[in-house]
């Protein structure tokens, strides 16, 4: 019992429960093919308690094995539209600091209109996870489309 | 030492360990679009450990981030078949109470037979989850193609 | 400050933190239709804290509710190639000990080059896990497509 | 109400080509696969293949290649079989049929049928 | 292609009576959890009428008196009480793959 009320007591990031979901807020200008994040309970249902947004992009904060999430639905799309328009590929990875540069996480549309997917990796603080989004198709908006996001799992 | 044992002597509801794995029971009638879950050891490796079931959808028990996520494979299912008969769509939402009604992930099959998805949501104590299968494809009903499950990530 | 100090001072397999995160190390000869993983550090970012590789497959050490995920991507793929080699089929299941077995998850490829996934299942000590690919086709060995995983999440 | 109203019946020479229409009703037509199903008088019923108006995507029984051609008018709600190279075998009743509510090969709805009779 | 092997191939059953009929696929016919049979009745200078879908569905509109199950490769249609309407021919059908087959029918008549 005094576990419990002690556990409830302690603030939750000295536990390493950092966690974070982002909507997509805007893509970059058309040389630069970042997904530019967003997050905060006034966006919705997306929230950052422990990792920061830095330009859009998510910085850790905390060191450990996170479990990283994506979900990235082409806008107005049929699989007709996504053949046509291949390859459009969607990579996740650290792309700061420079010397940690590195993909996490890659998958390519080809014929479907969403891409969905999920893995397990160290990350430290300080790393700054982009995600690439390569082609000439736009990432849809809608909250229930397109997210991203990343679990502290242990340090 | 005195920690860990305290922590196993401790119901693991009080550490807010809610999970849930569910398994397809069936579709609703015609006009009903919702799928209808079934969980327990009884009917192989699904399991209920804190939100209940009701009337086949999901309810919370606790309030908090939950990692959900979803497979759902159609019955017999070629790409000729998944590409003849678009949209074939799949949405989690919460669907009560109705003051809460929000779609949270949303996929479409286009030239697939499958879509697989997870993401961090907040949920409150009461929110019953519903999966809603738009078209006019079949789910199959088999344990490894179609689960839907929760897990308790932090307050 | 205490409890977090305690906390740290015991070791994480106390705490029943155990993960893993594996890499593609090769494909078995002709009839075996098993995928052969590889982690640790030094290969990479892939790691095994508590379960263990036992011939390329992994084997779990503690008992509990398992987060199960895994990306395969077939190699030099395109839409074309998927649907002209189908089925090509990707399942993980318990391979041993034989009492054990079952299809814990089960995915075709269809049209698409990629397929991940996840879900929540317990395991036991001693439950071997094996990806099996049917098909023609090669998996990637990119570790950024593909990865298989396991997270502790229960008791 | 759903209706499948089919043309009237046929007496062709053998050698000769047929070609039988199903119209449409009570329902949005490029919705619904149509099926066709052969039926040999006093025996049992033999699908040959479908239609689906929407994207004029068709299949057919390994049987019946070359033997049916399945084409549709969206503007009429009318699907259309057209039977080549007509023998005393292809004498029978054939059925246009609609599936159920889902998307699969079980036929709810059917037409009353249009005979077909080959004979010099 | 699947063979549907209908028994008997015709039968008598008295008013009121059960009259059961079976269907033997070649192979399963169960796939995805469902078992892909239906069975309709067929009465002369008729079309064929959907009476059970999935092996047990009973279609919209048919009397429970019309009753369907089985799985893998043996099913039955089961009607009772039989009445007198019942007389005409009934066959199962499989949708598991293409091209879906029929069984060769079972005449029922009403004694």
């Known amino acids: 019992q005094r576990f419990a009320q002690a556990q409830q007591q302690l603030p939750l990031e000295s536990l390493g429960w950092d966690v974070a979901e982002l909507q997509l807020n805007h893509t970059g200008p058309q040389q630069d093919p970042r997904l530019y994040w967003q997050g905060g309970p006034a966006l919705g249902r997306s929230f950052l308690h422990g990792p920061e947004l830095d330009k859009g992009q998510l910085r850790i904060h905390r060191d450990g094995i996170y479990m990283v999430h994506i979900q990235v639905t082409l806008a107005i799309c049929s699989s007709t539209t996504a053949s046509r328009h291949h390859p459009t590929t969607l990579a996740v990875g650290i792309c700061s600091p420079a010397s940690r540069s590195i993909s996490l996480l890659r998958l390519s549309f080809h014929q479907g209109c969403t891409i969905a997917s999920q893995r397990l990796t160290p990350l430290a603080r300080g790393d700054t996870l982009c995600t690439n989004l390569t082609g000439t198709l736009l990432p849809s908006r809608n909250t229930d489309e397109t997210f991203f996001g990343v679990q502290w799992v242990r340090p | 030492q005195r920690f860990a044992q305290a922590q196993q002597q401790l119901p693991l509801e009080s550490l807010g360990w809610d999970v849930a794995e569910l398994q397809l029971n069936h579709t609703g009638p015609q006009q009903d679009p919702r799928l209808y879950w079934q969980g327990g050891p009884a009917l192989g490796r699904s399991f209920l450990h804190g939100p209940e079931l009701d009337k086949g959808q999901l309810r919370i028990h606790r309030d908090g981030i939950y990692m959900v996520h979803i497979q759902v494979t159609l019955a017999i299912c070629s790409s000729t078949t998944a590409s003849r008969h678009h949209p074939t769509t799949l949405a989690v939402g919460i669907c009560s109470p109705a003051s809460r009604s929000i779609s949270l992930l949303r996929l479409s099959f286009h030239q697939g037979c499958t879509i697989a998805s997870q993401r961090l949501t907040p949920l409150a104590r009461g929110d019953t989850l519903c999966t809603n299968l738009t078209g006019t494809l079949l789910p199959s009903r088999n344990t490894d193609e179609t689960f839907f499950g929760v897990q308790w990530v932090r307050p | 400050q205490r409890f977090a100090q305690a906390q740290q001072q015991l070791p994480l397999e106390s705490l029943g933190w155990d993960v893993a995160e594996l890499q593609l190390n090769h494909t078995g000869p002709q009839q075996d239709p098993r995928l052969y993983w590889q982690g640790g550090p030094a290969l990479g970012r892939s790691f095994l804290h508590g379960p263990e590789l036992d011939k390329g497959q992994l084997r779990i050490h503690r008992d509990g509710i398992y987060m199960v995920h895994i990306q395969v991507t077939l190699a030099i793929c395109s839409s074309t190639t998927a649907s002209r080699h189908h089925p090509t089929t990707l399942a993980v299941g318990i391979c041993s000990p034989a009492s054990r077995s079952i299809s814990l998850l089960r995915l075709s490829f269809h049209q698409g080059c990629t397929i991940a996934s996840q879900r929540l299942t317990p395991l036991a000590r001693g439950d071997t896990l094996c990806t099996n690919l049917t098909g023609t086709l090669l998996p990637s060995r990119n570790t950024d497509e593909t990865f298989f995983g396991v997270q502790w999440v229960r008791p | 109400e759903v209706q499948l109203q089919q043309s009237g019946p046929e007496l062709v020479k053998p050698g000769a080509s047929v070609k039988m229409s199903c119209k449409a009703s009570g329902y949005t037509f490029t919705d619904y696969v149509i099926h066709w199903v052969k039926q040999k008088p006093g025996q049992g019923l033999e699908w040959i293949g479908y239609l689906h108006p929407y994207n004029d995507d068709t299949k057919y029984n390994e049987k019946f290649k070359g033997k049916a051609t399945l084409t549709s008018d969206k503007s009429s709600s009318t699907a259309y079989m057209e039977l080549s190279s007509l023998t005393s075998e292809d004498s029978a009743v054939y059925y246009c049929?609609?599936?159920?509510?889902?998307?699969?090969?079980?036929?709810?709805?059917w037409g009353q049928g249009t005979l077909v009779t080959v004979s010099a | 292609d699947i063979v549907l092997t209908q028994s008997p191939a015709s039968l008598a059953v008295s008013l009121g009576q059960r009259a059961t009929i079976s269907c033997r696929a070649s192979?399963?016919?169960?796939?995805?959890?469902?078992?892909?049979i239906h069975w309709y009745q067929q009465k002369p200078r008729q079309a064929p009428k959907l009476l059970i879908y999935?092996?047990?569905n009973l279609e919209s509109g048919v009397p429970a008196r019309f009753s369907g199950s089985g799985s893998g490769t043996d099913f039955t249609l089961n009607i009772h009480p039989v009445e007198e309407e019942d007389a005409a021919t009934y066959y199962c059908q499989h949708s598991r793959e293409l091209p879906p087959t029929f069984g060769g029918g079972t005449k029922l008549e009403i004694k």
């Open positions: 192979k399963s016919v169960s796939a995805s959890g469902y078992t892909w």
């Open positions: 999935l092996a047990s």
């Open positions: 049929a609609r599936r159920g509510y889902y998307d699969y090969a079980w036929f709810a709805d």
